[in-house]
């Protein structure tokens, strides 16, 4: 018997078989559809990405194609020639072998083939064109990969040359560096040495200042002495003349006042003629005790007794009661005179109070009382004040009645808290009060909200600490 | 001596206002600053509000601000608090307390008023 | 806000025997000027509250002095030395360093 059948192996391809008897023709055709799928990076009929491939890419995918179209045109030749050789015999032997309708077997085996050969032909016409196309495609990619080689090749010459020329510079300009750093060195060098001079030359001078301050006192002290003295004599010598141009020179008698050496306060040590501010013995009414205190011969006309002064927080004023009643700190600097003193002082004649004040901005401020005075101790030194004039509010900041003082060892004021002891230093705190010129010294950026700094309410509020006060008196009639 | 006398408490339906006085005595009451504190029945204390000596600083809890509006008038020595769109929760004894320094130091209550019941309810 | 925690929130103590309260605050109490700024104050049963210790540790006037307020930052303590029946009533810590001023719950001291 003998039959055809048209069937596809397990790798996927086509085969044709033909049996004749004890023979059978087996025909395995190419693979047409050797072009990959559309997943592919190489697809063969998907439109070209806008995108150039890599040049390498390009060029893996023109062989593949080659070598695809020379194993088709090997196999259509092998085919030809299997045809031509194996056929003649095969029809041969058929021909003598097999009745007639075997050949029309033959015929449709024929004819297959040749549309296999003609379909085989088409593709291979396609892959032609493809190969043409994608040729054309990579000559002009390679054209214009040469053209940007070109360009790079120019542009990395001309950054080359660039480089070369910044090279120079760099080398120039490290050379100045060099040069300028060796100056520096000597430089710094000279500075450091000089340096070491002038702190040598500081310490000798803080030495001397030291020195020198000290014979200031006590310049300013024989100067006041001095100046006394100076103005007794003139005084003497006036009266001489007068007494001696005098036509009744004879029967006068010489009456020489008696020469005022001791002050009450500096309001009489201006009027005697000692015009200059500093320090100067002042001495308690009705008594010989003496205390050293400030005149301010500048201000207002002078004549100020300083009682209180504040500039630099170097005298802790967190102090006992006996140590306000007494005075403590440098007149020269920061101080209080003393509760006692001005009680008495106060207490006699009729007294004006000034305060001076100075904020962290460089405004400064004053507040004028036209009557002050101190109770005694019996009455925890009370303050009395009134007539307010001045720049630093115009509402009193010390509390109106005036309040006792407190100290951080004696609670007077009228609160269920210690001012004194809240506050810092002691005051007429009220509870507590507008104002504490005693408080705590805050310096610059550290002086606001805080409770418990030097405060004066109606100028500049509850939590600004001041940088400097001055409290001073005169007598009113000045 | 120093006395805080506490006026207008009583019991409001919720969304209803209601004002309560403070009235001081014994001290200079333009120099210091004044609170409102509140206690709901069985709870502890919170603060309500605090307006400063002049008036010209004002605080308000959370819980209260854009109801409550705490006043003062010096000339006449007190203290007020409008409450205004009621709730239940503001339900409590309500005190007016003043601070322990005078001239806005804010460092504790000195005295406290005897207290006022405010019921909201229903 | 800051936030106050008490302890204990009940107190019973025997009279003539010593009481501790601590109270901590979410952050630091102290101000730069030095002081701390916790009061503590005590709610006596049917009276309003009275100020016992001011910034930390300074007793009030008229408080009796076997009260005293101790520590510093967030950390803080009331004794009471000797306990009397007058001192029964809740007891409150307070801040006073930000707004809003906050209160601790409050501790309940009994005799027993």
């Known amino acids: 018997y003998s039959n055809f059948r048209k069937s596809v192996d397990s790798t996927g391809r086509r085969q044709y078989q033909v049996q004749n008897g004890p023979c059978s023709y087996t025909f395995l055709l190419p693979e047409t559809d050797s072009c990959r799928s559309s997943s592919s990076p190489y697809m063969s009929n998907a439109v070209q990405r806008d995108a150039p491939l890599d040049y390498d890419d390009s060029v893996q995918r023109l062989q593949v194609l080659e070598n695809i179209l020379e194993n088709n045109t090997q196999w259509l030749m092998k085919l030809e020639n299997y045809i031509q050789d194996n056929m003649k015999k095969e029809m041969v032997e058929i021909q003598q072998n097999v009745v007639q309708n075997q050949t029309a077997v033959m015929i449709e085996i024929g004819t297959s083939l040749l549309n296999q050969t003609a379909a085989q032909t088409r593709k291979l016409t396609d892959v032609e064109a493809q190969v043409l196309n994608q040729t054309t495609r990579l000559e002009l990619q390679l054209l214009q990969h040469s053209i940007s080689t070109n360009k790079l090749e120019k542009q990395i010459l001309d950054q080359t040359s660039e480089i070369n020329k910044l090279q120079n510079k760099n080398s120039f300009l490290e050379q100045k560096v060099l040069d300028m750093e060796g100056k520096h060195s000597e430089q710094l060098q000279s500075m450091k040495e000089q340096k070491d001079e002038l702190q040598v030359l500081v310490s000798k001078q803080s030495s001397v200042i030291d020195e020198l301050e000290k014979k200031l006192v006590t310049a300013t002290v024989n100067n006041s002495l001095l100046q006394k003295q100076q103005h007794d004599l003139m005084e003497t010598v006036n009266s001489l003349l007068t007494m001696m141009s005098s036509p009744n020179s004879k029967s006068s008698v010489a009456i020489r006042k008696e020469e005022q050496t001791t002050f009450r306060d500096c309001a009489e040590i201006f009027k005697s003629g000692l015009t200059t501010s500093g320090i100067y013995t002042l001495t308690f009414p009705n008594s010989t005790e003496e205390i050293k205190a400030y005149c301010d011969m500048d201000v207002g006309g002078g004549g100020w007794t300083v009682i209180q002064h504040r500039e630099d927080g170097s005298v802790d004023f967190q102090r006992t009661w006996k140590e306000y009643k007494e005075g403590f700190g440098s007149p020269l600097g920061e101080y209080w005179l003393g509760n006692e003193f001005v009680s008495q002082l106060t207490g006699q004649h009729r007294y004006v109070l000034k305060i001076q004040l100075k904020d962290w901005e460089g405004n400064e401020a004053h507040s004028l009382y036209d009557h002050f005075y101190l109770a005694g101790e019996e009455s925890n030194y009370r303050i009395h004040l009134t007539g307010l004039t001045g720049t630093a509010g115009k509402i009193s900041s010390i509390s109106q009645p005036g309040s006792d003082f407190s100290t951080k060892d004696s609670d007077n004021d009228k609160c269920i808290c210690k001012c004194s002891q809240m506050l810092s230093g002691g005051w007429w705190f009220d509870a507590c009060g507008p104002s504490n010129l005693n408080g705590q010294y805050y310096p610059q950026k550290q002086n606001t909200n805080k409770f418990n700094g030097i405060k004066w309410y109606y100028w500049k509020g509850s939590g600004y600490s001041l940088k400097a006060t001055t409290m001073m008196i005169r007598p009113a009639d000045f | 001596e120093v006395q805080l006398v506490q006026s207008g408490g009583g019991v409001v339906q919720p969304g209803r206002s209601l004002r309560l006085s403070c009235a001081a005595s014994?001290?200079?009451?333009?120099?210091?600053?004044m609170h409102w504190v509140r206690q709901a029945p069985g709870k502890g204390l919170e603060w309500v509000s605090y307006i400063s000596s002049s008036g010209s600083t004002i605080y308000y809890a959370d819980s209260v601000k854009g109801r409550f509006t705490i006043s003062r008038d010096n000339a006449k020595n007190s203290l007020y608090l409008q409450m205004n769109s009621l709730r239940a929760e503001d339900t409590a004894v309500y005190y007016c307390?003043?601070?322990?320094?005078?001239?806005?130091?804010?460092?504790?209550?000195?005295?406290w008023g005897q207290g006022t019941l405010v019921t909201v309810s229903s | 806000d800051i936030v106050m925690t008490q302890s204990p929130l009940s107190l019973p103590v025997t009279p003539g025997e010593p009481a501790s309260i601590s109270c901590r605050s979410s952050?630091?109490?102290?101000?730069?000027?030095?002081?701390?700024?916790l009061d503590w104050y005590l709610q006596k049963p049917g009276q309003s509250p009275q100020l016992l210790i001011y910034l930390g540790s300074n007793r009030a006037s008229g408080v009796p002095d076997r009260f005293s307020g101790s520590g510093s930052g967030t950390d803080f303590t009331l004794k009471i030395s000797r306990v009397e029946a007058e001192d029964v009533g809740v007891y409150y810590c307070m801040q006073g360093l930000q707004t809003p001023p906050t209160f601790g719950q409050g501790t309940k001291l009994e005799i027993k």
């Open positions: 952050q630091s109490l102290l101000h730069s000027n030095g002081y701390n700024y």
């Open positions: 307390a003043r601070d322990l320094l005078d001239y806005d130091i804010l460092t504790g209550y000195g005295y």
């Open positions: 014994g001290f200079t009451f333009s120099s210091y600053g």
